[in-house]
Amino acid sequence: AQHVTTQLVLRNKGVYESVKYIQQENFWIGPSSIDLIHLGAKFSPCIRKDQQIEQLVLRERDLERDSGCCVQNDHSGCIQTQRKDCSETLATFVKWQDDTGPPMDKSDLGQKRTSGAVCHQDPRTCEEPASSGAHIWPDDITKWPICTEQAKSNRTGFLHMDCQIKGRPCCISTKGSCEITTREYCEFMHGYFHEEATLCSQVHCLDKVCGLLPFLNPEVPDQFYRLWLS
């Protein structure tokens, strides 16, 4: 059986949309599947790598690598999207390409970044972890760390940094899929909203879905002990 909830929820484009949340009901009347997984149920994606989920994550990453920051021209906010999802008339799509990207580092002026820009994250304005020396962030945004400390500046002069961010990674469903969404939409979908991150590649949704002890390597499920828990 399914339980359907419909509600007007604030979406990425800054408008309220009617959204359906479909919850698979427990046949025996009890905890939901998400709760059961958290309690230690035998859920194979938490025990070993699941090919289907792995393919989903890789597909999400490939899309994210090509994303940019969609900044609304009316200064209402910005969100990380694909070019096709960013209005050509109402917004500006900030994407480094060809020769427009910043240099990888002040020590290497010739090599330009082509992956990015990312809403509210830039190697030139992140103090911790700083992109310098032996720790220059790679030219692949899906390999960027979470910036834990931004440079103290009210305005950076960068369009993708000075906007109000409207969406962050949200882990939705037992499959551990990730979407950049508003907090409101994420909460309605019973997802896990990552306030600290800017990209889906920075969060490990399956680790959140599984709960219990975190995976030793966030990319590799290792909860073999579930076989004895349930």
């Epitope: 103090e127 700083a130 440079a151 002069g157």
Partner: antibody, heavy 123, light 106 residues
Framework: QVTLKESGPGILQPSQTLSLTCSFS??????????VGWIRQPSGKGLEWLTN???????YYNSVLKSRLTISKDTSKNQVFLKIANVDTADTATYYC???????????????WGTGTTVTVSS | QIVLTQSPAIMSASPGEKVTMTCSAS?????MYWYQQKPGSSPRVLIY???NLSSGVPVRFSGSGSGTSYSLTISRMEAEDAATYYC?????????FGAGTKLELK
């Protein structure tokens, strides 16, 4: 308000070491992304970049003059220093220090310049 | 090193006249920066990232170009624009400036 002021000996003899100081206010070189550069200009001629120093103590020099240049900073005193060893009459010029804009540009640029100090190398 | 060649070396213009000067790079650069220097004064930045106007710079100034060819335009010359203009690149070390274009008032 950001200001920079250069100071130096004014006149010195060939083979001596030129020591210049750039004293600044309105910003700190301990601030992430900040930098200061030195540029010189012989009288009636164009601008020549010499060196940059950054908040993280990274230093970059003009390769043509690198063996003679040394840049350093005293963050607590808001000062940057430049030494040019073994000077020659060709080093006679007005020396400018300039702040490097930390943000806003895809690269960087010299957004605020000092008034310059004139140095004459003469025997 | 990247050599920047500015032309013309000297030019004159009447008030209200449109002025265009160019900067040619010996190899491709990503962006160009333009500075204005008046006699007895230090340089000040006019344009950064090829076409962005620095704060406080009149809108009659504009920059354009890409690759090896860049230009600075003054839409309507004013007396206070008489100065020497330098282009500068930050695409590779050593950082280099052009030799300058001296703009005189006719």
């Amino acid at each position: 308000q950001v200001t920079l002021k250069e100071s130096g000996p004014g006149i010195l003899q060939p083979s001596q070491t030129l020591s210049l100081t750039c004293s600044f206010s309105g910003f700190s070189l301990s601030t992430f992304g900040m930098g200061v550069g030195w540029i010189r200009q012989p009288s009636g001629k164009g601008l020549e970049w010499l060196t940059n120093i950054w908040w993280d103590d990274d230093k970059y020099y003009n390769s043509v003059l690198k063996s003679r240049l040394t840049i350093s900073k005293d963050t607590s005193k808001n000062q940057v220093f430049l030494k040019i060893a073994n000077v020659d009459t060709a080093d006679t010029a007005t020396y400018y220090c300039a702040r490097i804009a930390a943000y806003g540009s895809n690269y960087w640029y010299f957004d605020v310049w000092g008034t310059g100090t004139t140095v004459t190398v003469s025997s | 090193q990247i050599v920047l060649t500015q032309s013309p070396a000297i030019m004159s213009a009447s008030p209200g006249e449109k002025v265009t000067m160019t900067c040619s790079a010996s190899s491709s650069v990503s962006y160009m920066y333009w500075y204005q220097q008046k006699p007895g004064s230090s340089p000040r930045v006019l344009i950064y990232d090829t076409s962005n106007l620095s704060s406080g710079v009149p809108v009659r100034f504009s920059g354009s170009g890409s690759g090896t060819s860049y230009s600075l335009t003054i839409s309507r010359m004013e007396a206070e624009d008489a100065a020497t203009y330098y282009c500068q690149q930050w695409s590779s070390y050593p950082l280099t400036f052009g030799a300058g274009t001296k703009l005189e008032l006719k």
